[in-house]
């Protein structure tokens, strides 16, 4: 498939090409009649419907005003100004503001808790499988296998710290070398970026919101993938990460520190431990080939146990079989030796929902997965709603200016680096890059933060998670200190190297451009977002894993042609956009390929057919269910009652009329209602703080 779907002719600026988002075409079609293009690009049939009477403010706008959907929407204040309110109104408004803040914090709390439970759910569903991935002996010799194992395990357990700690315990037990561990750490870095991509999917209801949110989330993915693409071969060739970190570890005489501070966990743990508690040692034990662990449940049953180490006397066939020569004797009849035995006495059961159900891990995991995704989705919707009502007028202006404005010249370049530090600091505070980037995603979606600003924040988040790991490593026991510290430092320097590659020079900020491209595609074909997630985080790693198991020859035999085709397509794409005259006429565009290879439209038809069965069964009562429905099938009719699918008829009939973007309306409520996003009854006077 061509990298830029539906490209008829090569355009000078591929960034400006938008996959069918509202208001994106360079020229507006004839307003009075249907325009049927019959060229080989197969442009969609455009229909115009009569718009409501209030929308006399030109809805069909000049292309210059709306040609970039990446411009942040101006959330205009629809409420009465503060100065125009009476005392009662001001008091009421103040308490409304306080209430909103409490609600926002509450939903944010449950949002973070649901992320934690989502991680637990993934561990219950795929944790044991993840552990078994690690026990593969080929990791040592095949860095590519190590990489995909890192990705798969982190995706399965939804926590890079879990997969990293397994790697650390394996290195300190000499089951794995630091050299073999580095690709796994790189993979874990990729795997951890799936969380905020899942969170972005929850904003599927609004096309423009989804475009921004999905691009904002996937900028993390692309940064990690591109970093690995460059740095893994460099590491395999030079072992620079291993050498640098080894020098650091050997040059310092580290003393065991204190545990990394659990700041956010202190608040969330009291709630999450009432839902489920896991025995994470089981995954590590499976990774270390402990046969007994395979039959153990990950669900923690006993929270208070008493471990009594004792020596028991056991008979042996002869004194040659003694465990220790000094602990061996005979009573004249039998030969005896002493064996150290640990008796574990269960004292008190854990206090969580699943403690007495004795359900299999898969069942508990599935229940928690569904529930946590529903809570996550619900909280996200509410956070977006509350932020949407709060961030208007002056509040929005102040926040946006603070976050997105650069320092004055000549220090403008420093802004991004400050954002990296802020991202690192915030991640250090919340102790999780997933939580930080997931919290960032809805803010990008509603247009508070630009992708350009979210990018350094995300990069900082990557650094922040490694500083946490370094602190955790310093708190490790003596035998694990060196290995855990070296691995944490490898993680740190890998991210630093990635930043040096893809951030300092604006030209190299490829992840932003790639994420925007993916955002455009996903905004038009929302199923493509799920497709992307499955392909990049499951299918590609699993394919590489399978091919690696088959051996180097098979991997190279399949991999080389695939890589060659990808490079060929990229080179051709580059020539088409930069200097098409160099190419023969046939290769100046993708029209020489069958439609299914250069456009997502035929695939969209297939997906629509496949998901057609869901359209009749879509649930309207629940906004959350509706979002899931919209994601799958773009079905308009079923979601009308909850107004969660934008451009209902437009999506159904393939209309590509540039409707005026929300920022050009005088009233945000009108603009949203015009797009079928909020019911008319919602157009009440809004209360804003300023």
């Amino acid at each position: 498939m061509a990298p830029w779907p539906e490209l008829g002719d090569a355009q000078p600026n591929p960034d400006k090409y938008l996959e069918g988002a509202a208001g994106q075409q360079p020229t507006a079609p004839d307003k009075s009649k249907e325009t049927n293009k019959t060229d080989n690009t197969e442009a969609p049939v455009t229909k115009i419907e009569l718009l409501p009477s209030y929308s006399t403010a030109t809805l069909i706008d000049e292309p210059t005003e709306v040609d970039d959907p990446w411009n942040l929407p101006t959330l205009q204040d629809s409420g009465i100004k503060w100065s125009e309110r009476d005392t009662k109104g001001k008091i009421l408004c103040f308490f409304q503001g306080i209430g909103r803040l409490i609600l926002l914090l509450g939903f944010l709390y449950f949002f973070v808790c649901s992320l934690d439970i989502l991680s637990s759910a993934f561990q219950l569903v795929g944790g044991k499988m993840a552990g078994q991935f690690f026990s593969n002996s080929s990791i040592m010799s095949n860095p590519l296998l190590g990489l995909v194992i890192g990705v798969l395990v982190t995706v399965l357990v939804q926590s890079s710290s879990t997969s990293t700690s397994i790697v650390v315990s394996m290195v300190s037990s000499s089951l794995l070398t630091v050299r073999a561990a580095i690709p796994i750490i790189m993979g874990a870095n990729i795997g951890t970026s799936i969380t905020n991509t899942i969170v972005a999917l929850m904003q599927v209801g609004d096309r423009s919101e989804f475009r921004r949110a999905f691009a904002g989330a996937t900028v993390h993915d692309f940064f990690n993938w591109l970093s690995v693409l460059v740095l893994l071969p460099v590491e395999v060739a030079t072992h620079y990460l291993e050498i640098i970190t080894q020098l650091i570890v050997e040059s310092f005489h580290f003393k065991n520190g204190e545990d990394a501070p659990d700041l956010l966990k202190v608040i969330t743990k009291p709630f999450t431990k009432l839902i489920v508690q896991l025995d994470k040692k089981v995954i590590s034990q499976i990774a270390m080939n402990d046969e007994k662990a395979k039959n153990k449940s990950l669900v923690k049953i006993w929270c208070k146990t008493f471990t009594n180490k004792t020596q028991i006397n056991v008979t042996v066939p002869s004194t040659a079989n003694c465990t220790s020569p000094s602990l061996c004797w005979t009573d004249g009849i039998q030969n005896w030796t002493m064996k150290n035995v640990t008796y574990k006495e269960n004292i008190a059961k854990c206090q969580h929902i699943f403690v007495n159900f004795h359900l299999p891990d898969l069942a508990v995991g599935t229940i928690l997965l569904i529930l946590s995704l529903l809570v996550l989705c619900g909280c996200l919707i509410m956070i977006v709603k509350i932020l949407g009502s709060v961030l208007k007028g002056q509040v929005a202006t102040v926040i946006k200016k603070t976050i997105n404005t650069d320092f004055p010249f000549p220090f403008a370049w420093l802004t991004g680096y400050l954002a990296i530090l802020v991202g690192a600091g915030m991640t250090f505070i919340v102790q999780s890059s997933s939580v930080f980037t997931s919290a960032l995603t809805p803010l990008i979606g509603i247009g508070v933060i630009t992708i350009e600003r979210a990018y350094p924040l995300t990069l900082g988040s990557n650094i922040g998670t490694t500083t946490t790991a370094i602190l955790a490593a310093l708190a490790s026991p003596g035998n694990a200190l060196r290995s855990s510290l070296q691995i944490a430092l490898c993680h740190f320097f890998f991210n630093i190297s990635g930043i040096l590659l893809w951030y300092p020079i604006p030209f190299t900020r490829l992840p932003i451009r790639m994420a925007k491209g993916l955002g455009n595609i996903s905004a038009k074909y929302r199923w493509f977002a799920v497709f992307y997630l499955i392909i990049f985080f499951f299918l590609i790693p699993l394919t590489v894993f399978g091919l690696s198991l088959a051996g180097w020859r098979v991997l190279v035999g399949v991999g080389v042609p695939v890589v060659f085709i990808i490079i060929l397509v990229l080179c051709l794409r580059l020539l088409q956009s930069r200097c098409p005259r160099v190419l023969p006429k046939k290769l100046q565009n993708w029209n020489f390929l069958p439609l299914w290879m250069r456009s997502l439209k035929p695939w969209d038809a297939v997906v629509s057919k496949f998901t057609g069965c869901f359209q009749m069964r879509c649930c309207c009562c629940c906004r959350v269910c509706c979002r899931a429905c919209c994601l799958l099938c773009d079905c308009p009719k079923c979601c009308r009652c909850s107004k969660c699918c934008e451009d209902l008829e437009e999506a159904q009939e393939g209309q590509d009329v540039p409707v005026k973007a929300p920022e050009t309306f005088d009233n945000i409520t009108i603009s949203r209602e015009a797009q079928g996003e909020v019911p008319a009854s919602d157009s009440k006077t809004e209360c804003t703080a300023l």
Partner: antibody, heavy 121, light 107 residues
Amino acid sequence: QVQLVQSGAEVVKPGSSVKISCKTSGFFFTEYIIHWVKQSPGQGLEWIGGIIPNNDVTNYKQNFRGRATLTADKSTNTAYMELRSSLRSEDTAVYYCARWRNAYYSAMDSWGQGTTVTVSS
Amino acid sequence: DIQMTQSPSSLSTSVGDRVTITCTASQDVGTAVAWYQQKPGKSPKLLIYWASTRHTGVPERFSGSGSGTDFTLTISSLQPEDVATYFCQQYRTSPLTFGGGTKVEIK
């Protein structure tokens, strides 16, 4: 208290047999091993063998195998040693029974008073 | 069979003196060594087991040490009631074997 009471002295003719008893009290008979030790006049101690009364498993020193038979009666908490066939003058000795806690390394912590066996014509 | 060689075979010393009896095993027995005291006309009595552990009721003046092949029984301050023959015994492998004994007398 712990007691191992052995049967009285025996004077036997060469070529005959002798059976010595060791009645125990004050402890769980089945939790211990009963050993038999020979002490020739003016000599050191020599281990003959032992029996686990709980399962009647026995072991003997090589030169007593076939000559000594160890048995135990759980109902009366009594251990027996029979020195069979062709008793010789060198079998004249004091024979001790001693207990050893099964599965423990505390050695022979209690001994009987000894039974003197004299082989003479 | 493991041979246990005790030395000296007899010793005569004064009350209050420190007495040291040694026992050498013909091969490594770890710490599976016991010491017994046998007073004239009596049955043996356990003093030390596992090379250095005092049996219940044994006075503190008796102590054992050693591992491998060389073992020592020490009476820190000899008392009149300590006049007896002392035997070492190995219980590392079967058959159980005893030392020849050391006769302790008071001058």
